[in-house]
């Protein structure tokens, strides 16, 4: 009686259960009554990452430097190449098909999380007591200077973009 279902790592064709090709190999010929499945290794710059019956291997991803990409992990016959972005850039999608420059946090905002190859800078507004006076992809909000600890007094209040200005205490004459 011909099978209607096959074991794991097999596939059904022409009432025969044929072995799938292992990762890194492509199908050359289905099994028959007389022969086992015939598989061949993927060529240079090709891969297949599953047990399969594909007649063509997939091309490795190309990390295009013109799009700001570079190779993070070289592909093998069983894995695709993994791309990441050049320093100062991050991927525009999970597939990392292109890169954009990391965003800078404007004055009044500080870096909450520094960008990585796959995520952009996360900015946060500087809360009371903190400021940022530069546009930066690295700088956090800095605390206002504590005039008291320097034996000085606040001459000008700080904002989210400026530090306080300290000055000498008025002397009694």
């Amino acid at each position: 009686e011909p099978p209607t279902a096959c074991r794991e790592k097999q596939y059904l064709i022409n009432s025969q259960c044929c072995s799938l090709c292992q990762p890194g190999q492509k199908l050359v010929s289905d099994c028959t009554e007389f022969t086992e499945t015939e598989c061949l290794p993927c060529g240079e710059s090709e891969f297949l990452d599953t047990w399969n019956r594909e007649t063509h291997c997939h091309q490795h991803k190309y990390c295009d430097p013109n799009l700001g990409l570079r190779v993070q992990q070289k592909g093998t016959s069983e894995t695709d190449t993994i791309c990441t972005c050049e320093e100062g850039w991050h991927c525009t999608s999970e597939a990392c098909e292109s890169c954009v420059l990391h965003r800078s946090c404007s004055p009044g905002f500080g870096v909450k999380q520094i960008a990585t190859g796959v995520s952009d800078t996360i900015c946060e507004p500087c809360p009371v007591g903190f400021f940022s006076n530069v546009s930066s992809a690295f700088e956090k909000c800095h605390p206002w200077t504590s005039c008291e600890t320097k034996d000085l007094v606040v001459q000008q209040a700080g904002t989210n973009k400026t530090d306080v200005v300290c000055g000498p205490q008025d002397r009694l004459r």
Partner: antibody
Framework: QVQLVQSGAEVKKPGASVKLSCKAS????????IYWVKQAPGQGLEWIGG????????NFNEKFKSRATLTVDTSISTAYMELSRLRSEDTAVYYC????????WGQGTTLTVSS | DVVMTQSPLSLPVTLGDPASISCRSS???????????LHWYQQRPGQSPNHLIY???NRFSGVPDRFSGSGSGTDFTLKISRVEAEDVGVYFC?????????FGGGTKLEIK
Amino acid sequence: QVQLVQSGAEVKKPGASVKLSCKASGYTFISYYIYWVKQAPGQGLEWIGGINPRNGGTNFNEKFKSRATLTVDTSISTAYMELSRLRSEDTAVYYCTRHGNGVYWGQGTTLTVSS
Amino acid sequence: DVVMTQSPLSLPVTLGDPASISCRSSQSLLHSNGNTYLHWYQQRPGQSPNHLIYQVSNRFSGVPDRFSGSGSGTDFTLKISRVEAEDVGVYFCSQTTHVPWTFGGGTKLEIK
């Protein structure tokens, strides 16, 4: 239905070459190997080799490897076997055959090698 | 090469009687995938071979159930439960586990 139709009988002199054909119909030609089998008069069967029409890959009986060439023309779903440097022992019926979802044989081509 | 030895060479049988043909291989035909690629053919006079059984015991579509195959390793048998007139011809075993594929020398079945 699946059919393998072989070329007609051939008479050749020793040392000559011959090219036999096997035209397939009724199925997707590139999906199955075509194999060639020799049957000398009053003798058993001898496997010569096979060719995968998908990529032209071949496998051979070492005995025939130096003199047999297997090719295909996928545009006309035809497989060929060329036998070179013929000798009298090559006198036989040559069959093409295909298996996978059943086994199919051509009607055979009679080759006579005689001076 | 794997040598396939068939016996008997000739098999005279009375119509309706059973018949049995033996095929022995010089090495095991068990493939690493668990299958045994031993097959049986019939060749009627003046015709192309016709496959009866593949992988020891599987009948091809359209083959009468009076034909059956059995065996394992190196020892195989084709049985015909009740011989009919149309069964006359030469029977071959073959193996496709090892390259080159090889055939038995044939058993000629004739009616007594």
